[in-house]
Structure formats: structure tokens, C-alpha cells
């Protein structure tokens, strides 16, 4: 299901829907509000709840990736998507929860046996009337990946973090992306204020590790917003 | 609330056009990130999905109607529109539009509200 | 075409579990949507995404899909349970929506 790590019941595939009442089973009311919502809850009932815009999957969560909420040749605007799980159709490994790769369109987990290093992309375009279909997908965008047997070491490339050995997560350095240790406790971190603005950094930090949050140091509370400063603390 | 309300002949003869337009309240028809679709149900059978329209004019037809099937949009009005031609008695149904949600790259496509539905009778 | 099959009626007893599945070729990898239908009524969804609820949908109505068949259960059935149910997928091949043919439910 689409469920994400921000919460087991989580969900933010779609902007929410712009009705109130539930419509449920025994109603008159053909409607089911509340669902699909980017971000949070699974269940949020905001109606003016806004779902957060995305460029490419680098801005969303671990379980996310970016795509527009349409049909595929229509011009919607992107937003973070709770990840595919295992088994389930995709068309990119970002689109895949943590832990797994998207192999032929589908969502398989990433074995011992399959470990991903580097990603070869393949994007292949066939147009038809009035719309391009691809690889069996109409009005959409296939790749295809390369199969390699060993985790990306620290400094290796990378597309995400599961592409990185253990303790490791993939980074934005500079204009690409790689293998960085994930942070430790008392390291500073980057605490966002929106979600995804890591986007914007050309040296990007890691999260922060098992048992840790990025929260303000407690002898800075006094400092102004700007300097501020986040250390991985325990939760 | 986002409420669907279709409304045109109930009544149609063969070889004709079936016209029927569906009123959205409530919310845009313009959102970018919803599609309008209609769905059929003759009378004791099972749902049939007919077609689905995005505010931007794109269509998407089932095939076994597509050479006689039209979906059109309407922004400033707030509607969308089902031309059906060449109907016949198996046409009859009760007519449905919906509000349909999509996120193509996952192949998840459902729909969310409904309208109440007409029914439309082809009859001589 | 993508085809879903599903049994044309279930029955059960009130408080029992009523299951209702809806096969079709390697549905596991599908998305599959649940929608619940009384006479005289539009359907609402039920369930979607395999096993997801819409708010205000009782607990008690749950969604599992793997091979060749995806199940709705709805569990401690109750009289007002008595419905048609459709199963629903997107064909991506043939980009067009697929609906089961429905299932009865009666409570005995």
C-alpha cells in the first residue's frame, strides 16, 4: 500500500480532496473524503491542506518520490509520493520503498545477492497519435537498471540511499550525489523548516542516525532563528 | 463539499446521441491534479467505465466505445460532457460521473466522488 | 484487456467474516480498489490501494492483493453490509479503468 515512514498509517499520494462529509457505507454521500494526502497523517481532513511541490525525487522524504498525481502525458504539478512497496508497479527505483529497486516495473527487493552501485538509466520514447506510450506503459517513461553487486562505499555515487552500505546514506556534494556517514550523536545536522528544502543545498548532510532527531542544541535556544544550531540528539 | 450532479434526457431513440452533462460544485474542475470520468451501469449488471477527461482537454476512452464516445470539458462552467452516438437499446444504463484520482507512474487510478447517476433509456 | 473475476454472490451471517475476492492475472502487482454499491445508489469506495481505507469507512472493511487474487474482508458483518461489491484496477497497458463484475453480499 502506499504507506509511508513518517507514520505507519501515513499516506501522500494525492492532494486531498475538496469535500467534508465521509461517505461511507450505509451513507447517501458517494464520496471518500480525507484520503491521499502528501505528507503526515493518512487521514488528515484538512480541507485547505496543500501537498508539498517537488522538482525530483532528491526534495521528498526517504519514502517518497516526486511524480505528478495524472495520468502520465497531462502537465499536473509534481508532488512527493508515498513509495511503492515490494511487488507493486513502478517506474524508476525512487519510486520504491527503501530496502528495494524497480526491476522490470516492479517494485523486488534489494537481496543480499542484487546489491545496486551505480545506476544506468534508460529512457526509451515511442510516440502515438496524440500521446507517447513506452514499454508498455501509455503515456508514461520506463528505465531500465544495471545490476551490480556491491553497496556504494563513502564518496561512491549514488541515486539513494539504499544504493550506500550500511551507515552510509546518499547526499547531494556539489552537483551530484554520494555516499555519506550517516550522522552521529552531537554531530550537527540540518534541521528543515519545509519539508524537502534540502533540495536547495549543494553540500547536503545526512540524517541522523537510529535513535537520534535533529533538534536545537540546548545552550542555543537563545540564538537568533538564523544561527541556530541542530545536533543529533537522543529522542 | 464536492458534489456531481448529471442531468439530460432520460429518454433517447436509437441511432441518436446520448447527451449528458455533469455539474461539478464545490470544487475546480480546473485542479490540476484530478480527472472527471463517467461510468455506466445497465439495469442488474455491473459498473462499465465509459471515459475520463482532464481539465486540459485530454481524453482517455475505453475501447469498445471509443468510436462513438466524445468527453468535453467546460471550465468556465464547471462541467464536463458525454456524447454517446449511434446509441441502442443496449446503451441503457444508469449514467455516472465521478471524480477520478491517478498517479499513472504507480498505475493507481480510482474514483473518489460519484454523482447519483441517470438513467437513460433507449427506446423508440 | 485486463479481466477481474469475481464471484457473482457471497452470503454470511451477521458477526461472521465475509470474504470477497477478485482475481486476475498476477493482480498483486495492480493497485486494486474496493467500491460498495446498494441499491439505488452510486458506489462509494471502500478501500483502495489494496488494503488503504477512505475516512469515515469502518475498520471493519479491510483489503489484502497477492498472486492472483486480491480479497476485500469485511469483518463482524452487519445488515446494512448488504451490497454489491466491485473490485476496480487501471489496465496501464491499455490506459483504460477495469471493474470486476461485482459481488453480491447477503447477510443470511
Known amino acids: 500500500t502506499l504507506n509511508s515512514v513518517l507514520n505507519s498509517n501515513a499516506i501522500k499520494n494525492l492532494p486531498p480532496p475538496l469535500g467534508g462529509a465521509a461517505g461511507h457505507p450505509g451513507s447517501a454521500v458517494s464520496a471518500a473524503p480525507g484520503i491521499l494526502y502528501p505528507g503526515g497523517n493518512k487521514y488528515q481532513t484538512i480541507d485547505n491542506y496543500q501537498p508539498y511541490p517537488c522538482a525530483e525525487d532528491e526534495e521528498c522524504g526517504t519514502d517518497e518520490y516526486c511524480a505528478s498525481p495524472t495520468r502520465g502525458g497531462d502537465a499536473g504539478v509534481q508532488i512527493c509520493l508515498a513509495c511503492r512497496k515490494r511487488r507493486k508497479r513502478c517506474m524508476r527505483h525512487a519510486m520504491c520503498c527503501p530496502g528495494n529497486y524497480c526491476k522490470n516495473g516492479i517494485c523486488v527487493s534489494s537481496d543480499q545477492n542484487h546489491f545496486r552501485g551505480e545506476i544506468e538509466e534508460t529512457i526509451t520514447e515511442s510516440f502515438g497519435n496524440d500521446h507517447s506510450t513506452l514499454d508498455g506503459y501509455s503515456r508514461r517513461t520506463t528505465l531500465s537498471s544495471k545490476m551490480y553487486h556491491t553497496k556504494g562505499q563513502e564518496g561512491s555515487v549514488c541515486l539513494r540511499s539504499s544504493d550506500c552500505a550500511s551507515g552510509l546514506c546518499c547526499a547531494r556534494h556539489f552537483w551530484s550525489k554520494i555516499c555519506k556517514p550517516v550522522l552521529k550523536e552531537g554531530q550537527v545536522c540540518t534541521k528543515h523548516r519545509r519539508k524537502g528544502s534540502h533540495g536547495l543545498e549543494i553540500f547536503q548532510r545526512c540524517y541522523c542516525g537510529e535513535g537520534l532527531s535533529c533538534r536545537i542544541q540546548k545552550d542555543h535556544h537563545q540564538a537568533s532563528n538564523s544561527s541556530r544550531l541542530h545536533t543529533c540528539q537522543r529522542h | 463539499q464536492l458534489q456531481l450532479q448529471e442531468s439530460g434526457p432520460g429518454l433517447v431513440k436509437p441511432s441518436e446521441t446520448l447527451s449528458l452533462t455533469c455539474t461539478v460544485s464545490?470544487?475546480?474542475?480546473?485542479?490540476?491534479?484530478?480527472?472527471w470520468g463517467w461510468i455506466r451501469q445497465p439495469p442488474g449488471k455491473g459498473l462499465e467505465w465509459i471515459g475520463t477527461?482532464?481539465?486540459?482537454?485530454?481524453?482517455y476512452y475505453t475501447p469498445s466505445l471509443k468510436s462513438r464516445v466524445t468527453i468535453s470539458v467546460d471550465t468556465s462552467k464547471n462541467q464536463f460532457s458525454l456524447k454517446l452516438s449511434s446509441v441502442t437499446a443496449a446503451d441503457t444504463a444508469v449514467y455516472y460521473c465521478a471524480r477520478e484520482r491517478a498517479i499513472a507512474v504507480a498505475a493507481i487510478v480510482f474514483f473518489d466522488y460519484w454523482g447519483q447517476g441517470t438513467l437513460v433509456t433507449v427506446s423508440s | 484487456s485486463y479481466v477481474l473475476t469475481q464471484p457473482p454472490s457471497v452470503s454470511v451471517a451477521p458477526g461472521q467474516t465475509a470474504r470477497i475476492t477478485c482475481g486476475g492475472n498476477?493482480?498483486?502487482?495492480?493497485?486494486v480498489h474496493w467500491y460498495q454499491q446498494k441499491p439505488g445508489q452510486a458506489p462509494v469506495l471502500v478501500v483502495y490501494?489494496?488494503?488503504d481505507r477512505p475516512s469515515g469507512i469502518p475498520e471493519r472493511f479491510s483489503g489484502s492483493n497477492s498472486g492472483n487474487t486480491a480479497t476485500l474482508t469485511i469483518s463482524r458483518v452487519e445488515a446494512g453490509d448488504e451490497a454489491d461489491y466491485y473490485c476496480q484496477v487501471w489496465d496501464s497497458s491499455n490506459d483504460h479503468v477495469v471493474f470486476g463484475g461485482g459481488t453480491k453480499l447477503t447477510v443470511l
Open positions: 464545490g470544487g475546480s474542475i480546473s485542479s490540476s491534479n484530478y480527472y
Open positions: 498476477n493482480i498483486g502487482s495492480e493497485s
Open positions: 477527461i482532464y481539465y486540459s482537454g485530454s481524453t
Open positions: 490501494d489494496d488494503s
